[in-house]
Every structure is written in C-alpha cells, then in structure tokens.
C-alpha cells in the first residue's frame, strides 16, 4: 500500500476505561498531530478509518461495527463503546486518508476492573483543596459528551467505600461535591457514579479522583532559611571536610517552583575551581509545605576556601531570600602544661600531660560552633 504518515504509538495517551461502562475516545490525530479539525478533514473528502490490535497480538484487524446493540460505533472523530468489555484492551489506530493523503496514529486502550470500593489500576487525577479556606468544589471529571444537556443524570458521590451522606463538611450537589471547609481528614479518593438513560438503556460512568488538602495561600510566606543562621559558625582547619547545610522551608503554593542554590563568592559552585559537591533532600508536611536541604560539601578544605563567602539562596513565588554561612579558619588552641606545686605533686612534679582548656570544652570549639 502507498505511504502513510505514521505517528507511531502515542503512549502519552494511555487511555484507561472501566469495564462495562461507556467510553468515548477521540482520535488523537486532530488533538495533537494535525493542524486541522475533523470537520475540515471531512469537508475535504478525507475518511477516518479505525482498526485495532488486540492485547498480546501483532495482527491489525478492523473494528467490528456490526455488534449487537451497536456496542462499538464511530461518530465523527469519536470511537464509542456502549459499553466496554475487558477484551477490548489493545492498541487502536485511527487513519485519515483519501487517494492522495494518509496520516495515522495508534494509542493504547486499557479496560480495567474496579473493586467494591472503586479501587483499580486507573491512574487518578489529583485535586488540591486549600486547608480551612472556605467553600471549595470538585467536579465529576470527564463526563462531557456522554449525554446531551437535555438528559438529567443522577450522580452519587462516595468517599472510599462510603456513600457521602450526613458528612459534616462535604455536600453532594449534582456534578459537584462541595467542601464547606477542608481539613486533612478530607484527604482521600472520591468517586462519582453518573447514571443516565440512552436509547432505552441505562448506563453508568464511574469517575474517581484523589483529594489532597494543602496549605492555604492565606498562610503562605516567603521561603524561610533555617540554616545557615547566625548561631552556627563553621570553624575548620585546612584539610578537614567542610559541610554546610542549607535548610529552607517553603509554604505550599499552587504551581510554584521552589528553588534552593548556593553561591560561593557570588558565583555558582560549578564556576569555582574547587571540588564542591551538593546533595539535596526534600521532605513534605501533610499539607505539602516543603523543606529542602542542600548540603554543600568540600572534602579537603583549604585556607583559601575558608576565606570565601558561602551564601544560600531560596526562591518561590512568594519571594527570594539569602543567608550567608559564617565560615572561619580554626585557630589552634594553645597547649597548656601546668606544673603542679604546693606539695600536691612532690613526687610527680610536672607530668607534662596537656590539660583541656575548661573555657573551650573538651573538643576545643565553642558550644555553638559547628564542625
């Protein structure tokens, strides 16, 4: 057959649908690959052809559009299942062509089963609600196009296994679920079951999403650098390892990029001719506030390195902050030899052993100094 622009398998569109429920799948050509829509293509005399490859098979085969009750049908650029079966799983291809033009793309469709509490291998969208923020809503997702606006479906909402009724702060309102005030206890999976009639049959759509309660913008602050701080001095002798942690707290901010970085003498560490490594760790609170720690490490510090300026910087959508670490070269402590006199050491008279300086403590550092 003649050449066809083959966009391959579009794995970005890993479509998952529930068994025994309707599914409408738009041909991805018009959404992601071509610059014109289906109507334009149809007007130009192009035909949309569908075929598929079953799971664990290599053979492409036509889709059977003559099944009882039109279980699978095509409408414009949409492939309809009313409803799906488990063995509809496979790779589906839509091809747009006429005698002079051809373009096609494949995509995987997975029909999945759910358990009695709506758990399944389905990847769930996450909806973030601000903690103690006032009324917020989630909407039953991906139900557009399944029934006309003249049809009034029934919608039943669940949290986990349980139908939502008599919840203090969560109220079902048709396609929406309203949270009068969101708390950490509202974290979880929420499912809407939409029931609608069509051509003398009743269909159900099940949609689950994860609600995550996060920090409120009302409480958001610019980044806070906990370390380095004014209480810790990094005193080192040349040849020792210098470790300076930069620990920064970031309030949760929707779509904010949190950044932490070090500068040495005003330059990025990569631009300085010294052997520096930086290790980062990130932790999150229950409301997704973030703590980032970047540890700057110089294995064998030189006296030159100990004269440099080490500054930790942090930035979020709320602002930018910086804090310099106090780094010093350690001055070796004088070693005292005390002659014991006055009869105490008549026989031992001057053992010559060094005695630790009681002012400096056993390890010759100030209490708040850091090694």
């Amino acid at each position: 057959s003649e050449r066809c622009d083959d966009w391959g398998l579009d794995t970005m569109r890993q479509i998952q649908v529930f068994e025994d429920e309707p599914a409408r799948i738009k041909c991805p050509l018009f959404e992601h690959f071509l610059k014109f829509n289906y109507s334009t293509a149809h007007s130009a005399g192009l035909t949309l052809i569908w075929y598929w490859t079953r799971q664990d098979r290599d053979l492409e085969e036509p889709i059977n559009f003559r099944l009882p009750e039109n279980r699978i049908s095509k409408e414009k650029d949409v492939l309809w299942f009313r409803p799906t079966l488990l063995n509809d799983t496979g790779n589906y291809t839509c091809m747009l062509r006429n005698t002079t033009y051809c373009s096609k793309v494949a995509f995987p469709l997975e029909v999945v089963q759910k358990d009695s509490c709506f758990n399944s291998p389905m990847k769930l969208p996450v909806h973030k609600l601000y903690i103690e923020y006032g009324i917020q809503r989630i909407t039953c997702p991906n139900v557009d196009g399944y029934f006309p606006s003249s049809v009034k479906p029934t919608i039943t909402w669940y949290m986990g296994c349980y139908k939502i009724q008599n919840f203090n702060n969560v109220i079902p309102e048709g396609m929406n679920l309203s949270f009068l005030i969101a708390f950490i206890s509202n974290n979880g999976n929420y499912t809407c079951v939409v029931t609608y009639p069509e051509n003398g049959r009743t269909f159900h759509l099940t949609r689950t999403l994860t609600v995550k309660v996060v920090g409120s913008p009302k409480n958001a602050v610019p980044p806070v650098i906990h370390s380095p701080n004014d209480h810790v001095v990094y005193e080192k002798e040349p040849g020792e390892e210098l470790l300076i942690p930069c620990t920064v707290y970031f309030s949760f901010l929707m779509d904010s990029r949190n950044e932490v970085w070090w500068t040495i003498d005003g330059k990025k560490p990569d631009d300085i001719p010294i052997d520096v490594t930086i290790n980062e760790s990130i932790s999150h609170s229950r409301t997704e506030d973030e703590t980032r720690t970047q540890i700057l490490s110089i294995k064998k510090v030189t006296s030159e390195d100990l004269k440099r300026s080490y500054v930790c910087h942090a930035r979020s959508a709320k602002g930018e902050v910086a804090k310099a670490a106090t780094v010093k070269q350690k001055v070796p402590a004088p070693r005292y030899t005390v002659e014991l006199a006055c009869g105490f050491g008549a026989t031992g008279g001057g053992s010559g052993k060094p005695i630790p300086n009681p002012l400096l403590g056993l390890d010759s550092t100030h209490h708040h100094h850091h090694h």
């Epitope: 529930f18 068994e19 025994d20 358990d115 009695s116 039943t156 079951v193 159900h204």
Partner: antibody, heavy 118, light 107 residues
C-alpha cells in the same frame, strides 16, 4: 440482554441447609453487586445482603447474618446463597438482584421457591 | 433500620383512573427511594429510582416525587396491564428496606 437465571425450587427438611444459585449473563458479573431478597406471602420484601463478585466483599442485613452466607464464582458468573439451620420461617421465594453500587435493583432473577418441611 | 410505611395496602381502580401511592420513611432518606412493580408469579421490575427518575423503558404515565421522608408514586391513567403490587424501597442506607406493598385491583 442482562439475565439472572436462578436454580429451581427446593424442598428441604427443617434443620438442614440449602444453596441457591444465580447465574448472570449479559454484563460484567465481577463489576456489579449481587443482592439477595426474601419474599414471604403477606410479609413483603426483605433484603438479605449483597456480594461484590470482583473481590468477594459482602454486606449483610444484621437480621440474616447468621442465616445466610453469600459467595460468588467469577469463572462461571454465578452467585450463591447458602441458608443454614432451616425452619418454616425460611420458607419463601428468594430473588437475586443486581445493583451497580447504587443500592437499587435494576435486574432481578425469576425467583427460587424454598419450602422447609418438618 | 429505616421503616418504609406504604399506603394504602389495597387500591381498587378502574381503567384510566389516576392513582397515588405514598411512602413515608421513618427518617430522612434524601431523595433515595425506588419504586418497583410486581405482577403475580413474576419478579419485581424497577420503575423509578432517586424518587423521580424513570427507569429506561418505563412509560411516562408513571411518575415519582418527594424527598426527606415523604414520597409519592403516581400513575396518571391506569391501564389494565398496570394491575400489580407496587413496592417502595429506600436505597439511602444499609440495611435496605421496602414498603409492605400496594395491590392495585379492579373495582
């Protein structure tokens, strides 16, 4: 196209047990709840409990907790209800009925008549 | 358990009569009430769910209404084939419970 086919009538002795079956076809058996309902003349309808064949999860009406045991076999798309320690009070028509998570019953079996004799 | 009190028990009707059956829940069940029709020797058939939603294939002479504790099922113009027993059921919470039934019989 959805069909629930129940086993035939049963005549059993008091104190014995019985197992009634309900074979489903025309839909994904694993993905809907199967309920059991008791009907005695002049006593209306009583919900016994339900099972989700996909994972075997069950909910029972407390009144029937020690009387009925619900099971399901996914490979044959069949739900079962075992009734134990039978008495004349258990003489009734038993229906299986499907629900899609929503607690109302869109398809019913034809019913199985159980007669308990002393 | 939620008790569903259905009235009347018996309802004598003539063809094309308007029929009203009521069901009262012992506590608030929102709008979660279903109605079934059962003919002699047959299994029940779903007519309405969520109080006012007609199940597919059910003629539009059947309507339902109500919320909270009081529910009404109406047949606007009774046909001979409507002679049957009608049950209400709350599908609000477990255990699911039914009304005692209303038998439509010819006058």
């Amino acid at each position: 196209q959805v069909q629930l086919q129940q086993s035939g009538p049963e005549l059993v002795k008091s104190g014995a047990s019985v197992r009634i079956s309900c074979k489903a076809s025309g839909y994904a058996f694993s993905g809907s709840w199967m309920n059991w309902v008791k009907q005695r003349p002049g006593k209306g309808l009583e919900w016994i409990g339900r099972i989700y064949p996909g994972d075997g999860n069950t909910n029972y009406n407390g009144k029937f907790k020690d009387k009925a045991t619900l099971t399901a076999d996914k490979s044959s798309s069949t739900a079962f209800m075992q009734l134990s320690s039978l008495t004349s009070e258990d003489s009734a028509v038993y229906f299986c009925a499907r629900d899609y998570y929503l607690f109302y019953f869109d398809y019913w079996g034809q019913g199985t008549t159980l007669t308990v004799s002393s | 358990n939620i008790v569903m009190t259905q009235t009347p028990k018996f309802l004598p009707v003539a063809a094309e009569d308007r029929v009203i059956i009521t069901c009262k829940a012992s506590q608030d069940v929102s709008n979660e009430v279903a109605w079934y029709q059962q003919k002699p020797g047959q299994s029940p058939k779903l007519l309405m769910y969520y109080a006012s939603n007609r199940y597919t294939g059910v003629p539009d002479r059947f309507t339902g209404s109500g919320s909270g504790t009081d529910f009404t099922f109406t047949i606007s113009s009774v046909q001979v084939e409507d002679l049957a027993v009608y049950f209400c059921q709350q599908h609000y919470s477990s255990p699911l419970t039914f009304g005692a039934g209303t038998k439509l019989e010819l006058k």
